[in-house]
Amino acid sequence: ITRQSLDPQRRAAPQQKRSSPTEGLCPPGHHISEDSRECISCKYGQDYSTHWNDFLFCLRCTKCDSGEVEVNSCTTTRNTVCQCEEGTFREEDSPEICRKCRTGCPRGMVKVKDCTPWSDIECVHKES
């Protein structure tokens, strides 16, 4: 049985601190107790779990680095979402740092796309 295929109605209500595992798994926002008898709620703002699981520990919430802004805060079921500050972007091949966007295009080229948190400006050759 995949975690997603379990009946959503059997998930613990948000206010519940503890519930019983379903087929050995606990719902998102929880982890399993070490005797497998209970599902224990993750701590809001500290840790989370996104799927049905048998984790002994919830996953630690990410803390945004300097140079990043928090777009979505961590909940018990979703990790923090961090984004590069304005004027910087995160490259696919080096996702751990935010790099400064170029301020302009080289001579003979024109900007066709602005800087975003995910990409540098895009330049194309001017039509002659």
Partner: antibody, heavy 117, light 108 residues
């Protein structure tokens, strides 16, 4: 009565491998998280690894990550620790323990792993 | 990682005296995940206290645990000859699970 009996320790050369086993009895093995804890000669206790009751989730100390693998066979009531790329600093008595986060409420007698050339 | 620092390193006391052992955490630890163990030479550790203050099965009531946050204490109200050993605190609040370096309680 809860009993944990480790085996598989011994002398191994640096870079070598060893598999420790822990035979459990006296409790519903498949329900409980289990751990390995080690103690170097004359030193304190160091947690090595833990595994959930079903075996679906595993955790490791940074010092052994990528080299050691914890596993369990619930049909045999047995816990394992596969140790690869052994180093001098891995030399210790290895204890199998019932539990993980809240406490280690039962311990085996330990098995000695000696890493030496 | 949460570092647990135990003090003192060695405690020299006489039978009948009170022993107070400290365990200080580098970050806040949930009381539910703080335990104390006793270990005698050549033996496996034995669980004394779990959940910071609950005595494990068969542990005499002269052993008690207290504390919260970053400061925890194990108290042995009246030391018996069999209590001279090394004591360790352990946290499971967040991975990796860690132990303190131990406090040796020796006969004065």
């Amino acid at each position: 009565e809860v009993q944990l009996l480790e085996s598989g320790g011994g002398l191994v050369q640096p870079g070598g491998s060893l598999r420790l086993s822990c035979a459990a009895s006296g409790f519903t093995f498949s329900s409980y998280a289990m751990s390995w804890v080690r103690q170097a000669p004359g030193k304190g206790l160091e947690w090595v690894s833990a595994i959930s009751g079903s075996g679906g989730s595993t955790y490791y100390a940074d010092s052994v990550k990528g080299r050691f693998t914890i596993s369990r066979d619930n049909s045999k009531n047995t816990l394992y620790l596969q140790m690869n790329s052994l180093r001098a600093e891995d030399m210790a008595v290895y204890y199998c323990a019932k539990g993980a986060r809240v406490s280690f409420d039962y311990w085996g007698q330990g098995t000695l792993v000696t890493v030496s050339s | 990682e949460i570092v647990l620092t135990q003090s003192p390193g060695t405690l020299s006391l006489s039978p009948g005296e009170r022993a107070t052992l400290s365990c200080r955490a580098s970050q806040s630890v949930s009381s539910s995940y703080l335990a104390w163990y006793q270990q005698k030479p050549g033996q496996a550790p034995r669980l004394l206290i779990y959940g910071a203050s609950s005595r494990a099965t068969g542990i005499p009531d002269r052993f008690s645990g207290s504390g919260s946050g970053t400061d925890f204490t194990l108290t042995i109200s009246r030391l018996e000859p069999e209590d001279f050993a090394v004591y360790y605190c352990q946290q499971g609040s967040q991975p990796p699970i860690t132990f303190g370096q131990g406090t040796k309680v020796e006969i004065k």
